[in-house]
Interface confidence: low
């Protein structure tokens, strides 16, 4: 089976306050079984932004139907961006278990927030 790669093609994304930000993430293999989660930041202080298995996450929607078994696109859209949303976002694959364990991370996408146009 193919080795899993997590592809975050954007090094950075710049969005005006109040707009939506699309953060791209695709995976190259359905194995191992387990959910995708998005975090802002790394290490113990990281913030959960989206979990495929939990919710709701009111400002976060998935770009494609992540419930489909064969789906490999885990890109998300975050609405109504504010300066507090700035940071580096990581798309992370977890291996199913009790509890789920982190398996592999994407390279990260830095989100910067521009002032709302006057």
């Amino acid at each position: 089976e193919e080795e899993l790669q997590i592809i975050q093609p954007d090094k950075s994304v710049s969005v005006a306050a109040g707009e939506s930000a699309i953060l791209h993430c695709t995976i190259t293999s359905l194995f191992p079984v387990g959910p995708i989660q998005w975090f802002r930041g790394a290490g113990p202080a990281r913030v959960l932004i989206y979990n495929q298995r939990q919710g709701p996450f009111p400002r976060v929607t998935t770009v494609s139907e992540t419930t489909k078994r064969e789906n490999m696109d885990f890109s998300i859209s975050i609405s109504n961006i504010t300066p507090a949303d700035a940071g580096t976002y990581y798309c992370i694959k977890f291996r199913k278990g009790s509890p789920d364990t982190e398996f592999k991370s994407g390279a990260g996408t830095e989100l910067s927030v521009r002032a709302k146009p006057s």
């Epitope: 592809i7 093609p9 190259t28």
Partner: antibody, heavy 119, light 108 residues
Amino acid sequence: DVQLVESGGGVVRPGESLRLSCAASGFTFSSSDMNWVRQAPGEGLEWVSLISGSGEITYYADSVKGRFTISRDNSKNTLYLQMNSLRAEDTAIYYCAKENNMYRFFDYWGLGTLVTVSS
Amino acid sequence: ETVLTQSPGTLSLSPGERATLSCRASQSVYTYLAWYQQKPGQPPRLLIHAARNRAAGIPDRFSGSGSGTEFTLTISSLQSEDFAVYYCQQYYDRPPLTFGGGTKVEIK
């Protein structure tokens, strides 16, 4: 102005080694991911290797994995490619290419240095 | 690995004519596609990124279009300096970054 100047090419025999250098100027080198791309005579472009700005992350094409090593010295604004166990099929012009800071295309290229592997 | 297929391999046209170059990806690369121009003895030069955005200093006779798997580079009216080899490159699926095989635009 951004400048990338490769050096270190030459003629070697199969199995020998060579180290290429790329001197960079005109941009913040330590913040830029850098690549080597090669072009065999009369052929198309082939990506060879990538190194992140910090030097912590490296990737290689399957065709060179285990034989080539990419590195950088940010204090000298210089990119390197150590090429070991050279083969005839490694004969090419080797270009140093800077990745765009937002996306992963190449916004600047050096003039290239020719590596010829021949017995 | 995403494979890029360029067509035609060679395009023979006269100055002033319109050139249409095609690049097809083996899987979707969204709009993460760049076009480069290469003249003999020179390194490639960035023309277009994000499928349709012209790089700085590139004349507006060059335009890019497409998304997903089908992309086109159009040169609206060929100038003598436009006769060269053109490569597409995807930067969605990486590594490896991949290039198309190139299209040579030659004088008819």
